[in-house]
Interface confidence: low
């Protein structure tokens, strides 16, 4: 009897109720391999999912995410809201960086602005949600007659975290 079932091709199942006859998969189900005793229910692409490939008798449906979302997980098992610079990814989606923090890359979380005063420098350019502060000369260097010994520190290259 097992041999009879192994002859059932993809798109069918071995129907025990009908003397192991190969029956077609019912609507909204599929079998991607031969010799199956049941057909699997087709995946339904609803809500934030949209159908990329319709279900057939031999293959499951494939989903993408609607505009403004991107796929996560193997086989696009989840849709996550698109993130931007100035945001961080949390389990609840993308959140704006809190004041005093920034994220200049597509990965990672919001990080605190550099504390210029720790290096004895002053803030030359204020930080934003997307960019770190730029530290300039120390306040003492800005007094009359003083010359700047070092140029302002360059902003970090976007897309990279400090090493």
């Amino acid at each position: 009897l097992q041999d009879l079932c192994s002859n059932c091709p993809a798109g069918t199942f071995c129907d025990n109720n009908r003397s192991q006859i190969c029956s077609p998969c019912p609507p909204n189900s599929f079998s991607s391999a031969g010799g199956q005793r049941t057909c699997d229910i087709c995946r339904q692409c609803k809500g934030v999912f949209k159908t990329r490939k319709e279900c057939s008798s031999t293959s499951n449906a494939e989903c993408d995410c609607i505009s403004g979302y991107h796929c996560l997980g193997a086989e696009c098992s989840m849709c996550e809201q698109d993130c931007k610079q100035g945001q961080e990814l949390t389990k609840k989606g993308c959140k704006d960086c809190c004041f005093g923090t920034f994220n200049d890359q597509k990965r990672g979380i919001c990080r605190p602005w550099t504390n210029c005063s720790l290096d004895g420098k002053s803030v030359l350019v204020n930080g934003t949600k997307e960019r770190d502060v730029v530290c300039g000369p120390s306040p003492a260097d800005l007094s009359p007659g003083a010359s700047s010994a070092t140029p302002p520190a360059p902003a970090r290259e976007p897309g990279h975290s400090p090493q």
């Epitope: 991107h70 996560l72 597509k106 990965r107 979380i109 897309g159 990279h160």
Partner: antibody, heavy 118, light 108 residues
Framework: EVQLLESGGGLVQPGGSLRLSCAAS????????MSWVRQAPGKGLEWVSD????????DYADSVKGRFTISRDNSKNTLYLQMNSLRAEDTAVYYC???????????WGQGTLVTVSS | EIVLTQSPGTLSLSPGERATLSCRAS???????LAWYQQKPGQAPRLLIY???SRATGIPDRFSGSGSGTDFTLTISRLEPEDFAVYYC?????????FGQGTKVEIK
């Protein structure tokens, strides 16, 4: 079925160039970040580079920065890695992988071997 | 750069035994950004766990991940013959993306 198929590997002399390709199928290529990851013989995995879905944002490991260039052609569903000024330490199997960003690399190609030797 | 250190380097066990693999990060990593892979000789890596504890599609439930901060663990509750392979952890918390050096699970 998602498939990634690398090609373009081979033997090249130090200082030479190679261009790797990765043909993607079975998913909406233009919606995903893509990465190159390499593995030297008998060693572990090393991330090399990634590129965003539009091809406008790229990032590189320090070890290849300035020598390698990642690019993509969404009309051809193909990812590329142009490798210049190759060194012996670049010898590795190079994998392309679909990059889910936070959630890792869910699909990988079979790899293509690049050997840099005189 | 976030350095991931895996231990032990090699784990010698018998089928049916429990395997516990460790991955320690040099700085705190959000658990959302930690993944585990399995690699067999001559094959590409295979995603097992993402988000530190979520199983990828098609991965048997004998594989589980846990941890947060700097310490993460991959557990194989009962080793099957096909589970003997090299396992890597990986972080995508910040650039550059990094992998651990790997743990080889071999048959005792």
């Amino acid at each position: 079925e998602v498939q990634l198929l690398e090609s373009g590997g081979g033997l090249v002399q130090p200082g030479g160039s190679l261009r790797l390709s990765c043909a993607a199928s079975g998913f909406t290529f233009s919606s995903y970040d893509m990465s190159w990851v390499r593995q030297a013989p008998g060693k572990g995995l090393e991330w090399v580079s990634d590129i965003d879905p539009t091809g406008s944002k790229t990032d590189y490991a320090d070890s290849v920065k300035g020598r390698f260039t990642i690019s993509r052609d969404n009309s051809k569903n193909t990812l590329y890695l142009q490798m210049n000024s190759l060194r012996a330490e670049d010898t590795a199997v190079y994998y392309c992988a679909r990059d889910l960003m936070v959630y890792g690399f869910d699909y990988w190609g079979q790899g293509t071997l690049v050997t840099v030797s005189s | 750069e976030i350095v991931l250190t895996q231990s032990p380097g090699t784990l010698s066990l018998s089928p049916g035994e429990r395997a516990t693999l460790s991955c320690r990060a040099s700085q705190s990593v959000s658990s959302s950004y930690l993944a585990w892979y399995q690699q067999k000789p001559g094959q590409a890596p295979r995603l097992l766990i993402y988000g530190a504890s979520s199983r990828a599609t098609g991965i048997p439930d004998r594989f589980s991940g846990s941890g947060s901060g700097t310490d993460f663990t991959l557990t194989i509750s009962r080793l099957e013959p096909e589970d003997f392979a090299v396992y890597y952890c990986q972080q995508s918390y910040s650039y550059p993306v990094t992998f651990g050096q790997g743990t080889k699970v071999e048959i005792k």
